[in-house]
Structure formats: structure tokens, C-alpha cells
Interface confidence: low
């Protein structure tokens, strides 16, 4: 359904909301609902000399049989319900008298409902409605062993492991306005550390003293350790309980879910199920080895008469998980949208490497010291997300397969700059199977951790520009973080991009960074890459951007926990065949991040190969004319000269595999 429109008469006053219904929007974001009306009997004009407009506009929200009037507008004046004073506005009225578009700021869960745009003109009346569903939930997440053990990178990964992403300040603010409170400092997506407090008390004053609100410690060094606030958006599948008279150990619970065609649910999935109304007064195992239960109907014997996802702890200070051999129900998840967690993940490195969520009980609040110590002990496991490499290491060294001579006919394209104005250089290169005039590659000069001849040296890893799909500038801030994580990297910081720039990195593509700014490094300024620095070299910035805007992303990879190897055969591989070939060799298709990390270790191949995201790339350490130009870097093959478009999955190429 698109919209509901009603009108008393044909060919009379008509109102429309040209927007599909229901409209699903993220917690904490803003919403614009377009509403236009046509009044044939009283044509409107925008000339300043006309008399005031007579039509009356009314916006209301209908939920659970109750209508709340948000605002009323007539004769160019807008009266807003005082409860929504800072919340709703008509951005285009009265400048465009027939445009009743509504803007709603900082969406909260309770902003869900049916929005009605009603226009009255004399005795005529017409309206249109749109259902709005605010989706998502913010939850606090804590390391299993003790409080404040997550640095910024691990905080992001912890959320991702729990079917969530790190929350934005806007999402935490919206959750706070919805009633969320937590006296625990946690990372947010903009690299700030905050916590929401409704009832200020000793130990929880933060920077706001006795006033309610979200406390902030500002932008923190990424090595400092705190908890994290995660945001779970939605799930396609279903959370359900599995039980038996004798209950399950953790391993038995995992096996039981698998027997039922499912897997243990993550904390984020349980939160979404709770938000949808799940209520179970029985604790169950989750994928991160935590034990929790969702309470939607408060009762004294189920979580202390409080609502929420309750957590079972071993210690009175709300740390430590139950022993894996203790017995609880199993909370399972079935659906396609799960994030894989390796079978042995939680057995590696001891308890300090496991992250969990905490619920703060009212009679046992942990005080938050005003001076937080930096650098608490941290675990060393690097969390990764799909694809996860659950392979047993092969005792055999991977053989270097034979390669082919360059195919005659590969076309080199002169330097171009695409329509959007900021482009890198595509190069023809010798890779069989692309055919003449189809290979467009981009030069991603990157900076690496290990010394490659003739290349600048950046301690600590590789910064690279990433465009995961076929089109340019397609990633929101949240999607950008996930894209880097999916490729075995993390979103880069401004400092990392600056260091890469200083070491010679240039890329004329705007990309997200972890502080929610959008930047790109330019060593040799040219017309479409001027940005905010005119003719001076430097990292260009668009500053902090709304998280819903779309750009590319700059990722950072600091180590390779395994080995990337080049694979080929006479007929080469389609994308599916490449996946299967790598798997048949106890490996997986490498991610872009893994290829960058391998390139930084010296991997040099003048043949493009499939990667896990369906892209086609090749690493060049020693530049030569036939291999992607005059600079080292990882080259990307595009379909189109403006450097967009992924290769056809049925086309045949080599492959890069990864063995962990």
C-alpha cells in the first residue's frame, strides 16, 4: 500500500502522501513525510501580494485509538503542540503553500503510529495517512570478566557479534527519551563515550551534575576501555526457546538449537524479540555464553518487577557468567540474517575475550567514577564477522599455482574523471577473461605495515578505500562500519587516514571515517578534488555528516591472522566456482581487507582474482607498466570507466583464497 487518500468530492480538494506505507525508519534519525494538496476550486499562488491562504493544515498521529494533534497551520502561521515544540515542523510551508510536508526530529520508539495529514478548506476536507514504524533498540553491552574492558575497535566488533552495530549519539539520545537509563560509560559510533541518566545520583553525575540527560566524556582515545552501547535494527528470523526437563549446558544448548535447524541467538536478537513482546520467566543460554531472559510483563518473581532483558551473573557486582556446565534453557534463533560466530570462538583466550551485556539492577547500581582509568587489561582476540573462517589449518604449504601470459587486447584507458567529479585512475591490465575494452581498474595507493620496496611505511596497518557494491557513494555510516568489518577490517580513524596521507596516500573519493566525518586524501590537488582546501594538498573533509547520507568508506586492517594465496586453473572460475574451489582447499575466498593485509606483507600478482564480496582485485607491490600503472597498491576492476559496477559473477577469473 502506498497511502490512504480520502476526499469528499471528485475533482475537489485532494491530499496525497507519495510514500509507501508502512515507512520503516531508524531510531534516532529524522523523518520527512511528504504531503501535498491540490485545491482546484481555490488555486494557490506563491506571489507575495496574494491574500493569506485560507486552507487549514492539520498533522496528527493516531496510535492505539488515540489521536494526538502535532500541529495546525493556516494563513502562513504554524501552531505546534507544545509537547512537540522541538520535534515537528513544516519545512516548506508557507514558502510553498500547497506543501504540507512534515519533518520529525530525533525519532523515538513511541513516535511509531499512523500519521495523518488533513487539509480543510471551507466545507471541503481531505486527508492522507502513512504508517510509520520506528525500528531498532539500543542496549548496553559489557565484557564478561569485568567492567570497562572494550577499546573502540573491540566495542564495534562486540556489537557486530551480537547482531547489532555500535549506536550513534542520536540513537542513545532517542533511547534516553524513551526511558533508557544506564550508569555505565559506553562507546558510541562517533568515538565519544556517554551514558544516559534519568535520576542523577552519586557516582552517576558525569558532566551534567544533578540534571537528567545523557552524560558525555567527549571524544576519547581509541585505546581507552569502556563498555559499549549497541543498536540492533531488525531481524528477519525468529527467536524461540528450547527446553527439556533437565535443561542444557552451554554446549548442549548449542547442539539443541542446531538439531532444531537453528543456532543460539545473540544478545541483539534477544533484545529485538523482547521489543516485539517476548516474555519468558526462564533464563537461557545465548551465543556469547551469557544467560538471559526477556521480561515484558513485570512481576516480582521475574527480574525484580522490572521490564527488560535480564542477565544472570555469578558475582554480586554484575560480572562473570555462569559456568558453561550449569543448566539453563536454550534461546535459539532461526533465520537468514545471522552473523556467524566460530564454534570455538568463546573458547579462545579465556574469559576476558568474551563480551556480554549487562542490566543494571536498581538496588545494585555500579557507581561510575568521575576519573576513569585508562588502559585496563584487554583481551587479544580479534572478532571478525561474515565470512567467518572456520577451517582447520592445513599442514601443507599452499602451492603457488601456475600463471598465464597476459592476454592480448586488454585495453588501457587514459586518466579519466567521472561524472561525479572525484575519480581515481583506471588502468588496463593483463588479466585473461575480461575481453577487450571491459577492464577498468582503479588505483588504490595504500600505505602498509611491512616495508614494500619503494613504498612509504605506516606503523600499525593499512588504510584503504572501500566501495563494496557496484555503485559509488552507497553506504550510510552504519553500513560503512559493517562493510569494513565484513571485509576483515575496521573503519579507519581520521588519524590513520592522516598518517596514510602523510605517507603518500591519495584517493579522490569521499569516505566515512569512524568519527562520522567524511574525508578524502589529496596529494596533488586537481579540479574535481579540491574540497575544502582549494589548491593545497591535504585531507579534505566534509565534516561530521548525518549518518543517513551515503559515501564510500576508508577501512583499516592491521594484521592478517592467516594466509592469502592466489588460485587459478586453466578455465579459471566463476564467482561461485571460486568460492567452492577455496573451500575445497580448506580455505575461503579472501576478503578485501585480507588482500590488503597480504599485499602489505609483499603479495604481488598481476592477475585479478575474485574476492568474497564479489569484487575483482589484484595486489601490486612492484609497479610495472603492464600491471596497473606506476604505483604500488591494490587495484580494483570495474565494469565502467567511471569506476562503478562489479564484474558479472558468471565471468571467469582467478581467485584469492584465505586460510586461517
Amino acid at each position: 500500500a502506498v497511502t490512504v487518500e480520502t476526499s469528499d468530492h471528485d475533482n475537489s480538494l485532494s491530499v496525497s502522501i507519495p510514500q509507501p506505507s508502512p515507512l520503516r525508519v531508524l531510531l534516532g534519525t529524522s523523518l520527512t513525510i511528504p504531503c501535498y494538496f491540490i485545491d482546484p476550486m481555490h488555486p494557490v499562488t506563491t506571489a507575495p501580494s496574494t491574500a493569506p491562504l485560507a486552507p487549514r493544515i492539520k498533522w496528527s498521529r493516531v496510535s492505539k485509538e488515540k489521536e494526538v494533534v502535532l500541529l495546525v497551520a493556516t494563513e502562513g502561521r504554524v501552531r505546534v503542540n507544545s509537547a512537540y515544540q522541538d520535534k515537528v515542523s513544516l519545512p516548506n510551508y508557507p514558502a510553498i503553500p500547497s506543501d504540507a510536508t512534515l519533518e520529525v526530529q530525533s525519532l523515538r520508539s513511541n513516535d511509531s503510529g499512523v500519521y495523518r495529514c488533513e487539509v480543510m478548506h471551507g466545507i471541503e476536507d481531505s486527508e492522507a495517512t502513512l504508517e510509520v514504524v520506528v525500528k531498532g533498540i539500543v542496549f548496553h553491552y559489557r565484557a564478561i570478566s569485568t567492567r570497562y574492558t572494550l577499546d573502540f575497535d573491540r566495542a564495534q566488533r562486540a556489537c557486530l557479534q551480537n547482531s547489532a552495530i555500535i549506536a550513534t549519539p542520536e540513537q542513545l539520545q532517542a533511547a534516553y527519551e524513551d526511558g533508557f537509563h544506564q550508569c555505565d560509560a559506553g562507546w558510541l559510533a562517533d568515538q565519544t563515550v556517554r551514558y544516559p541518566i534519568h535520576t542523577p545520583r552519586e557516582g552517576c553525575y558525569g558532566d551534567k551534575d544533578e540534571f537528567p540527560g545523557v552524560r558525555t566524556y567527549g571524544i576519547r582515545d581509541t585505546n581507552e576501555t569502556y563498555d559499549v552501547y549497541c543498536f540492533a535494527e531488525e531481524m528477519e528470523g525468529e527467536v524461540f526457546y528450547a527446553t527439556s526437563p533437565e535443561k542444557f549446558t552451554f554446549q548442549e544448548a548449542a547442539n539443541e538449537c542446531r538439531r532444531l535447524g537453528a543456532r543460539l541467538a545473540t544478545t541483539g536478537q534477544l533484545y529485538l524479540a523482547w521489543q516485539a513482546g517476548m516474555d519468558m520467566c526462564s533464563a537461557g543460554w545465548l551465543a556469547d555464553r551469557s544467560v538471559r531472559y526477556p521480561i515484558s510483563k513485570a512481576r516480582p518473581n521475574c527480574g525484580g518487577n522490572l521490564l527488560g532483558v535480564r542477565t544472570v551473573y555469578v558475582h554480586a557486582n554484575q560480572t562473570g557468567y555462569p559456568d558453561p556446565s550449569s543448566r539453563y534453557d536454550a534461546i535459539c534463533y532461526t533465520g537468514e540474517d545471522f552473523v556467524d560466530i566460530p564454534e570455538n570462538f568463546f573458547g579462545v583466550g579465556g574469559e576476558e575475550d568474551i563480551t556480554v551485556q549487562t542490566v543494571t539492577w536498581p538496588d545494585m547500581e555500579l557507581p561510575l567514577p568521575r576519573n576513569i582509568t585508562e588502559g585496563e587489561a584487554r583481551g587479544s582476540v580479534i572478532l571478525t564477522v561474515k565470512p567467518i573462517f572456520e577451517v582447520s589449518p592445513s599442514p601443507l604449504e599452499p602451492e603457488e599455482p601456475f600463471t598465464f601470459a597476459p592476454e592480448i587486447g586488454a585495453t588501457a584507458f587514459a586518466e579519466v574523471e567521472n561524472e561525479t567529479g572525484e575519480a581515481t585512475r583506471p588502468w588496463g591490465f593483463p588479466t585473461p577473461g575480461l575481453g577487450p575494452a571491459t577492464a577498468f581498474t582503479s588505483e588504490d595507493l595504500v600505505v602498509q605495515v611491512t616495508a614494500v620496496p619503494g613504498q612509504p611505511h605506516l606503523p600499525g596497518g593499512v588504510v584503504f578505500h572501500y566501495r563494496p557494491g557496484p555503485t559509488r557513494y552507497s553506504l550510510t555510516f552504519e553500513e560503512a562500519q559493517q562493510a569494513c568489518l565484513r571485509t576483515g577490517a575496521v573503519i579507519a580513524s581520521p588519524e590513520q587516514l592522516q598518517a596514510a596521507y602523510e605517507a603518500g596516500y591519495e584517493q579522490c573519493d569521499a569516505g566515512w571515517l569512524r568519527d562520522q566525518t567524511v574525508r578524502y586524501p589529496i596529494v596533488s590537488p586537481r579540479t574535481p578534488c579540491v574540497g575544502d582546501k582549494d589548491s593545497s594538498p591535504g585531507v579534505r573533509t566534509y565534516g561530521v555528516r548525518p549518518s543517513t547520507e551515503t559515501y564510500d568508506v576508508y577501512c583499516f586492517v592491521d594484521r592478517l591472522e592467516g594466509e592469502v594465496f592466489f588460485a587459478t586453473r586453466l578455465e579459471q572460475f566463476t564467482f561461485q566456482e571460486a568460492l567452492e574451489f577455496c573451500e575445497s582447499h580448506n580455505a575461503t575466498l579472501a576478503t578485501t581487507g585480507q588482500l590488503y593485509a597480504a599485499w602489505s606483507r609483499g603479495l604481488d600478482k598481476c592477475y585479478a582474482g575474485w574476492l568474497a564480496d564479489g569484487s575483482l582485485r589484484y595486489p601490486i607491490v612492484t609497479p610495472r607498466p603492464a600491471c596497473g600503472g606506476d604505483k604500488p597498491g591494490v587495484r580494483t576492476v570495474y565494469l565502467y570507466p567511471n569506476q562503478t559496477g562489479l564484474p558479472d559473477p558468471l565471468s571467469r577469473h582467478h581467485a584469492f583464497c584465505f586460510r586461517g
Epitope: D532, V544, R545
Partner: nanobody, 125 residues
């Protein structure tokens, strides 16, 4: 209602001074870069001055450099533009506008999201 309101316009003499103020209603200015623009009759709207979120970075168009000064007071939700050494060619409708919280500030109108309704400045003998 979220809006910007300009005030302080009026008539001035060549060589004289005026002080324009831009007030935010319904939202905090401290997340936004703020720009001042002007539009003379029959001419395009031009960016003349802007201030970054922190106020640390300011930009001026060449024609007003050294004569106009932009300043901000986030606590009061205002951004002021002081117009000194006025010239007849400064006659225009002056608008303030905000763009998302960027740390440098542009003078291009297309970068700005929310606009005030303007205040008239007339410079004549």
C-alpha cells in the same frame, strides 16, 4: 518549530556600522556551521561569512574581509555578524543559514540546509 530568525537589519550610512543577529529557535546551534548570505535586487544570493561549529574557523568573501566580523554564542543560540565601514553596495537582504555540524565552513549556498527569512540592510546617504 525549528527555525532561524535574523534581526538587526535597517538603514545605515556609508562608513557606519550595523550588527545583525541570527537566533535559532527549537534547536541548538552548537552542532551546526552557520553562514551569512546576502541577496541584492536582481543578483544571486552570495555567501559572505561563515563560522565552524567551534567558532575556531571563519571564512569571509573577499568583498567583506576586514569590514565584517562573524561571531557565535552557542549558549545563547545566536550567531552575530558585525557590519563595519558600510558601503552602498552592501545593500541587500541578509540571510543566515545552518549546515550539518562540519568543522570547516563553506560559503556555497548549496551546502546549507536550514534558512532564515532574511533581514533587510539598506546603506545610503
Amino acid at each position: 518549530q525549528l527555525q532561524l530568525v535574523e534581526s538587526g537589519g535597517g538603514s545605515g550610512q556609508p562608513g557606519g556600522s550595523l550588527r545583525l543577529s541570527c537566533a535559532a529557535s527549537g534547536f541548538d546551534l552548537d552542532y551546526y556551521a552557520v553562514g551569512w548570505f546576502r541577496q541584492a535586487p536582481g543578483k544571486e544570493r552570495e555567501g559572505i561569512a561563515c563560522t565552524s561549529v567551534s567558532g575556531a574557523n571563519t571564512t569571509y568573501v573577499d568583498t567583506v574581509k576586514g569590514r565584517f566580523t562573524i561571531s557565535r554564542d552557542n549558549a545563547k543560540r545566536t550567531v552575530d555578524l558585525s557590519l563595519d565601514s558600510l558601503k552602498p553596495e552592501d545593500t541587500a537582504v541578509y540571510y543566515c543559514a545552518t549546515t550539518w555540524g562540519i568543522h570547516w565552513c563553506p560559503l556555497s549556498a548549496s551546502e546549507y540546509r536550514r534558512w532564515g527569512r532574511g533581514t533587510q540592510v539598506t546603506v545610503s546617504l
